[in-house]
């Protein structure tokens, strides 16, 4: 019996087609992805093949103005239109709290939404009962297939799930649910979830009875043969893991942003054992036409976005200096504003010993692309912020050793004075540079804000200590020459859309007046 698994993950609000780098589509003839194009390909496969499942491994939420405006209603609407068969909850599905998951998505999805390792307690337990499930048995042709869901147990540090959801260890939570499916004589089981490729492989290895793992969170690109675009494969598709009980378990993921449709064909014997598996992600490029009816629906929903981008979010009573002449040479108040917003967006009081789990922010000055003048009645709009942060990036959470941070700050000024983008703006950090010293030895003082303290204060950076830092995904990926961050980071979790973080902060504060306050000094 043959099953075709079509899968997406980490779509992050890319409902419209995008450029090759998943930013805003500029030249339509070279654009990719989007739900209208995805629908064309899915329907083509459904017509050609008998047993097809369309699955999503989480993080539909967060990433463009679509999510900012529609808050998840767009996800339910278009996933319903594409007739997804099941979805696993990702960490970003909790970005607007549990209510922001329940009302727009859980109540409106016409397909099951899954996670076995999230347990509700207190008053939430009855409210959310039945709206998401640990597993689902789906009819496929004349057979049934079991799908078990899972979600990163780091979600309380990455999003806003509140205090009434407990995120358990994935493997511990999955095994009894798989066992239940086995007692129901369901012998073909897919683990669908959002914990990253390393955990996907562990689940394949450790959870008895799982036949296939469809994952997300780490934006992993797997491919067999010559890759069709810029993404470099982390391994073959499918990636085969040998389980502890000796089975070959295919593990797949389909990069991110709806650029590819994962396509995996699995052959099962009559006892539900995987005989063979093969496939590849399908690049959704312009050779695949956009479905006209879905495209028309997208255009209808778009109207509200255009109106939103010119509405006032808040006011500034000071000039927001985002000029290259400032942000690439010294502390600039636009950099301070953005870093303060980044920290504010990551306030998670999950431990009594810590006032917060993260206190530090770094931001490449080259990523700040425009100032905002206060003389327009102080008004700040989404459109203004899109000029400051035009690249459609995210502000991510990483863990780094102090020694890596020291290297990063040396890199920040290794060729100071040439208006290059690597000069770092900061939050929760006091740095002093001596430019008379040779490159690689210019940081004379680096103090960081404590987290395990009731009164935050600045202490000298410790080289061997592990620190959490919020930074742009561009830096986490080694951009602007920050190779040491990419090479030495100990953990990397994708965060919220950059503009969304700053706009939320400005809306919350209502009136802002960021200052230049001595975060960066020269001796």
């Amino acid at each position: 019996w043959e099953l075709t698994i079509l899968h997406t993950n980490d779509v992050h609000s890319r409902l419209e087609q995008t450029s090759e780098d998943s930013s805003k589509c500029v030249n339509a003839s070279r654009c990719m992805g989007g739900v209208a194009r995805l629908f064309t390909k899915v329907q083509q496969i459904r017509r050609a093949e008998p047993n097809v499942l369309l699955l999503d491994a989480g993080d539909q939420y967060q990433g463009t103005i679509w999510f900012t405006v529609y808050k998840g209603a767009e996800v339910a609407h278009f996933m319903n239109a594409l007739r997804y068969d099941a979805m696993a909850l990702g960490n970003h599905e909790f970005d607007n709290g549990v209510e922001g998951l329940i009302e727009p998505l859980l109540k409106e999805a016409k397909f099951p939404i899954l996670s076995a390792n999230i347990k509700a307690k207190g008053p939430l337990a009855s409210q959310i009962s039945g709206l998401y499930l640990p597993y689902k048995v789906l009819p496929v042709g004349d057979e049934v297939v079991g799908i078990v869901g899972y979600t990163s147990k780091e979600t309380p540090f990455l999003s806003n799930p509140g205090t009434n959801l407990v995120f358990e260890d994935e493997i511990t939570a999955l095994q009894p649910e798989v066992d239940k499916l086995k007692t129901l004589n369901v012998n073909k089981i897919i683990a669908l979830g959002h914990s990253g490729f390393e955990m996907d492989k562990l689940i394949a290895q450790k959870v008895r009875g799982v036949d296939v793992v469809v994952g997300g969170h780490s934006n992993t690109f797997l491919y067999t043969g010559n890759p069709p675009s810029k993404e470099v494969p982390a391994g073959k598709y499918p990636f085969i893991v040998t389980s502890d009980d000796g089975r070959k378990v295919p593990v797949v993921q389909a990069y991110a942003f709806g650029k590819y449709l994962g396509y995996l064909k699995i052959e099962f014997d009559e006892r539900g054992n995987v005989i063979s598996s093969h496939g590849n992600p399908i690049l959704l490029n312009s050779s695949i036409p956009e479905d006209p009816s879905i495209k028309a629906d997208i255009n209808k929903w778009r109207i509200k976005l255009d109106n939103y981008s010119t509405q006032e979010l808040g006011k500034t009573i000071v000039y927001l200096d985002g000029s290259s002449q400032s942000c690439r040479f010294r502390e600039c108040n636009m950099g301070n504003l953005i870093c303060d917003a980044m920290i504010n967006n990551n306030l998670r009081h999950t431990d009594e010993m810590f006032w917060n789990h993260v206190s530090m922010c770094i931001l490449n000055g080259g990523g700040i692309r425009s100032p905002i003048d206060e003389r327009n009645n102080g008004t700040i709009t989404w459109e203004n912020l899109a000029a400051v942060l035009p690249f459609g990036g995210t502000f991510d959470l990483v863990q780094l050793k102090g020694s890596t941070l020291k290297k990063a700050f040396e890199h920040s000024v290794h060729r100071y004075g040439q208006s290059t983008g690597e000069f770092l703006q900061v939050g929760g950090i006091h740095v002093v540079y001596d430019l008379s010293r040779k490159p690689g030895d210019r940081v004379v003082k680096l103090d960081v804000l404590c987290t395990k303290c009731r009164v935050p204060s600045y202490d000298p950076l410790k080289m061997d200590e592990v620190y959490k830092v919020i930074l742009p995904n561009f830096l986490a990926n080694g951009g602007d020459g920050f190779q040491m961050i990419k090479d030495e980071l100990l953990r990397h979790d994708s965060g919220d859309q950059d503009i969304n973080v700053v706009s939320t902060y400005i809306s919350k504060m209502k009136v802002i007046y960021p200052a230049v306050e001595g975060r960066i000094k020269f001796s």
Epitope: R83, D85, K107, A109, K110, F111, P112, G130, L133, K136, V137, L138, P139, V144, L184, N185, V186
Partner: nanobody, 124 residues
Framework: ALQLVESGGGLVQPGGSLRLSCEVS????????IGWFRQAPGKEREGVSS????????YYADSVKGRFTISRDNAKNTVYLQMNSLKPEDTGVYYC?????????????????WGQGTEVTVSS
Amino acid sequence: ALQLVESGGGLVQPGGSLRLSCEVSGFTLDYYNIGWFRQAPGKEREGVSSSSASGGSTYYADSVKGRFTISRDNAKNTVYLQMNSLKPEDTGVYYCAAYRGWHPSLDARVYDYWGQGTEVTVSS
């Protein structure tokens, strides 16, 4: 919470008719596939009929084809099973069940929510 309540069961003579109702509360009916199942004394639960969320497609077990009709009134959040030409072998407890998804099914494993059942006896 999601609830399904069946009604309309009773004693009927062979060749007679009954109309079972399944009233759904706690969710919108048009998001759910609904199935009718029955369990005769000492036998396995078996699928009788199912209706897709849109109401556009219906399935019937071979044993009831041409005699039973499933229908839904989404406005009233109610699903019906019209049973004609009843036979003694149609006797049992009839359950309605629901699940979110696109494809109706007669496989009980697919259904997530169940009613308490209503008893149907076909006897002279």
